[in-house]
Interface confidence: low
């Protein structure tokens, strides 16, 4: 059931996954929605008693999809939009007055206003958010300074009240970046830069979509199922570099490399993975096992089960089960399978729940 | 591979599950061994630089069963005994001089020596460990005071150096407690006291074994698969009370209740679950899927896979697969299935790796 309303002075007890910092409850709800496992959240507003907890956004999960409600001044709680049918966007154009969003300040320069600062952030490969000191800022030498910031998670490491500054987010997810959009996928290629994370993926296209939605991934290398080293098969390496481009390109068979589409305006979905993967089993944490007619029905079942992230359909019992096969509904900590097996006859795929979370549909 | 040796001045990087406090590296290794997921650990000795980290035992896991080694003064690292063939015991009779193991001090009284204090702890239902102030303790009125302590995890919440005290653990796991050992399982019974945890279990015997090895479980209630409320089926509620006994016994069909065997001397294993559960599927996080001949072979496969905690064997493909069925190797955060399904034809069970971790084999 889709619950849009926020509950003031209510704290959801338990179920904590992680805590991030967001400027308000609305943004916390969006962060929860895009998190692979978050179903509920509690945001601690400035009216809460403990000032050290202000702006903290506590992401929560629950097998029952609900948690006990406790009265708490300044807490604002709600549910993710995962349960909702409407189209979503991570695009956030809001400017937050008198808030300093904290992160690694890797670039500081003068801009004439906050809008120009936001544009600079949007057009810098590494920038997640910015803080801009207005012309009323107490110390003269910091006035009109635009600080570009990034963090390992893409979210602020803290938020504090600071008079005469404004903060905001990069508008890359609004499809407003002027940075290069490179759609090519390079076969027989390994990029040899910093790995920031690795996930298991069935093909290079899924790897690219995961890279696109990872806060720090600028390019990727994917090792196919034929890669010689078994432990690296179906591995998607998410990568970055200081320059924003790969420094070294190595020729290797059975590997493919490419770039994040974060700077692109998309005519195709880049968040959801709608294909079926034949003779492929996705391994993960099992949510349920149900009998259904065919792999499309299994995908539908996964999409309608709020905690399901991916599935494997096994038709081995179809013949003696009224044409029904077994549908394994699964999840993991990051939304990707923990392992992929081939040659066992399964048909696997992902929830279509994420299709409503896609970017602005205009071609660039 | 079994690695018993400890690595001095070496820190295992990454893979953290949780941090507990132990008086030395040897005890840290035992804690890691009994933890459902720990494969490696790092212990911070007194020779380490940061005194706030002294005595911390960092439990770690790794899909590859190894982690990068980093040089660090005062760190002691090693591997769990899960990989080892020898019989194990959680029994720890050591007395730690000049160490205060911290927890909830719920009972303080005079004893003539540390041994008597340890006996008092062993014979108190709630006591996990104790600290005893010797007759050289600075303040006269605290001398010979025996403080009984407990914590939510059974492990100290901190350990600090304190002159003229000694500390140690309860000897319940050495089968030395004089507390009552109640082996009866009461059918059609619900105990209505504090739930401290709940796990999924296939039957009341497994529920009892889990209760026995939970630091604070004194008794339990198990809801069978016929229990009317679906969400409670196969649920094992771990319970406690201040008195150490259930306050209320309610008559309910399809429920069974009983007591922890922590005070018993066992002639039967109480840590490992060796039975097979027919027409039963255990759900969890999938580790691997392999083809094997029969459910015994599947159990063997799980026992030899170090991270495997339980399994489900499906024989549906046996007929057209050279007599082989599918063996699903699984794990979870607490070693128990996340859900149990009936009527799907699977045969499920647990790793036998835990059988070597059992209590002293003497009948009481």
């Amino acid at each position: 059931e889709c619950v849009i309303k926020l509950f003031s002075d209510i704290y959801f007890q338990g179920g904590d996954i992680t805590t991030v910092y967001t400027p308000n409850a609305k943004h916390c709800q969006v962060v929860c929605t895009y998190h692979p496992r978050c179903l509920l959240f509690t945001f601690m507003a400035e009216s809460s008693v403990d000032s050290t907890k202000w702006f903290s956004c506590i992401l929560k999960d629950s097998v029952t999809e609900s948690l006990p409600k406790v009265n708490m001044t300044g807490a604002i709680s709600g549910y993710s939009f995962k349960q909702c049918p409407h189209q979503l966007s991570a695009c956030n154009k809001d400017i937050y007055v008198d808030l300093d969003m904290q992160g690694m300040n890797y670039n500081g320069s003068v801009t004439k206003n906050a809008q120009e600062c936001q544009e600079r952030c949007t057009n810098d490969a590494h920038c997640h958010f910015f803080t801009y000191a207005t012309r009323q800022f107490p110390s003269a030498e910091h006035r009109n300074i635009c600080l570009l910031k990034y963090t390992q998670t893409g979210a602020p490491t803290g938020i504090r009240k600071l008079k005469k500054v404004v903060s905001g987010f990069s508008l890359k997810s609004c499809a407003l970046s002027n940075l290069a959009c490179i759609r090519d996928i390079f076969p027989s290629t390994v990029f040899a830069d910093n790995n920031i994370d690795s996930v298991v993926a069935p093909d290079a296209l899924v790897c690219r979509r995961i890279c696109t939605h990872h806060p720090n991934c600028l390019f990727f290398t994917f090792f196919s199922q034929e890669w010689p080293k078994e432990s690296h098969r179906n591995l998607c390496l998410l990568k970055t570099s200081e320059s924003g481009l790969p420094s070294t390109r190595i020729h290797k068979n059975q590997a493919l490399s490419g770039f994040s589409l974060q700077n692109c305006r998309h005519s195709i979905p880049v968040f959801c993975h709608s294909s079926f993967y034949y003779d492929t089993d996705f391994l993960g944490e099992e949510l349920d096992i149900v009998d259904v007619k065919g792999h499309e029905a299994c995908q539908k079942m996964c999409t309608s089960a709020i905690r399901c992230q991916f599935f494997t359909y096994s038709s081995s019992q179809e013949s003696h089960n009224k044409g029904k096969g077994t549908c394994y509904l699964k999840l993991s900590s990051n939304g990707s399978p923990t392992k992929i097996l081939h040659g066992r006859g399964g048909i696997s795929g992902y929830t279509l729940r994420l299709c409503k979370m896609d970017n602005v549909c205009t071609t660039k | 591979e079994c690695v018993i040796k400890l690595f001095s001045d070496i820190y295992f990087q990454g893979g953290d599950i949780t941090t507990v406090y132990t008086p030395n590296a040897k005890h840290c290794q035992v804690v890691c061994t009994y933890h459902p997921r720990c494969l490696l650990f790092t212990f911070m000795a007194e020779s380490s630089v940061d005194s706030t980290k002294w005595f911390s035992c960092i439990l770690k896991d790794s899909v590859t069963e190894s982690l990068p080694k980093v040089n660090m003064t005062g760190a002691i690292s090693g591997y769990s005994f899960k990989q080892c063939p020898h019989q194990l015991s959680a029994c720890n009779k050591d007395i730690y001089v000049d160490l205060d193991m911290q927890g909830m001090n719920y009972n303080g009284s005079v004893t003539k020596n540390a041994q008597e204090c340890q006996e008092r702890c062993t014979n108190d239902a709630h006591c996990h460990f104790f600290t005893y102030a010797t007759r050289q303790f600075p303040s006269a009125e605290h001398r010979n005071i025996c403080l009984l302590k407990y914590t939510q995890t059974g492990a100290p919440t901190g350990i600090r150096k304190l002159k003229k005290v000694v500390s140690g653990f309860s000897l319940k796991s050495c089968a030395l407690s004089n507390l009552a050992c109640i082996r009866d399982i009461f059918p059609s019974t619900v105990f209505a006291d504090n739930n401290i945890d709940s796990v999924v279990a296939p039957d009341a015997l497994v529920c009892r074994r889990i209760c026995t090895h939970h630091p604070n479980c004194l008794f339990f209630t198990f809801f069978s698969q016929e229990w009317p409320k679906e969400s409670h089926r196969n649920l094992c509620l771990l319970k406690t009370s201040e008195s150490g006994l259930p306050s209320t016994r309610i008559h309910k069909n399809q429920a069974l209740s009983g007591f922890s065997l922590q005070n018993c001397r066992h002639s039967i294993p109480v840590f490992c679950h060796s039975s097979f559960y027919y027409d039963t599927d255990f759900l969890g996080e999938e580790l691997d899927i392999v083809d094997v001949k029969g459910h015994e072979a599947c159990q063997k496969m799980c026992t030899s896979a170090i991270r495997c905690q339980f399994f489900t064997y499906s024989s549906s493909q046996e007929s057209h697969n050279k007599g082989k069925g599918t063996c699903y190797l699984k794990l979870s955060s607490n070693g128990s299935p996340t859900k149990i399904l009936h009527g799907r034809g699977g045969i499920s069970g647990y790793t036998l790796r835990l059988c070597k971790m059992d209590n002293v084999c003497t009948t009481k």
Partner: nanobody, 126 residues
Framework: QVQLVESGGGLVQPGGSLRLSCAAS????????MAWYRQAPGNECELVST???????YYADSVKGRFTISRDNSKNTLYLQMNSLRAEDTAVYYC????????????????????WGQGTLVTVSS
């Protein structure tokens, strides 16, 4: 009779400094771990800082970098130098012979915290 007597509290402006002292008598001071606790109205007893008999120190996160604990065994005296004071540091500060780890709840209870002084009030206000 064991005695711990605190002094040095008072009213100070935000950003200001104070030095608290605690004179101990009638027990083996140099063999004891010592501590400063504080309790603001309506709040739980909070451990501020400890110093072991051999000089090892611990500070609560909220005071790290601002407060310094020290001891002079020849004078049987414990000190707390408090700099960059904030409004949230307002509380009654108690000196304790920290023989059983941190106190739970009320700073004035004798069990399990060891010995306590009578407390000295620190008020940070403009």
């Amino acid at each position: 009779q064991v005695q711990l007597v605190e002094s040095g509290g008072g009213l100070v402006q935000p950003g200001g400094s104070l030095r608290l002292s605690c004179a101990a008598s009638e027990f083996t001071f140099d063999d004891s771990d010592m501590a400063w606790y504080r309790q603001a109205p309506g709040n739980e007893c909070e451990l501020v800082s400890t110093i072991t008999s051999d000089g090892g120190t611990y500070y609560a996160d909220s005071v790290k970098g601002r407060f310094t604990i020290s001891r002079d065994n020849s004078k049987n005296t414990l000190y707390l130098q408090m700099n960059s004071l904030r409004a949230e540091d307002t509380a009654v500060y108690y000196c304790a012979a920290d023989q059983w780890g941190s106190a739970e709840g009320d700073c004035t209870s004798s069990y399990p915290g060891g010995y306590w002084g009578q407390g000295t009030l620190v008020t940070v206000s403009s």
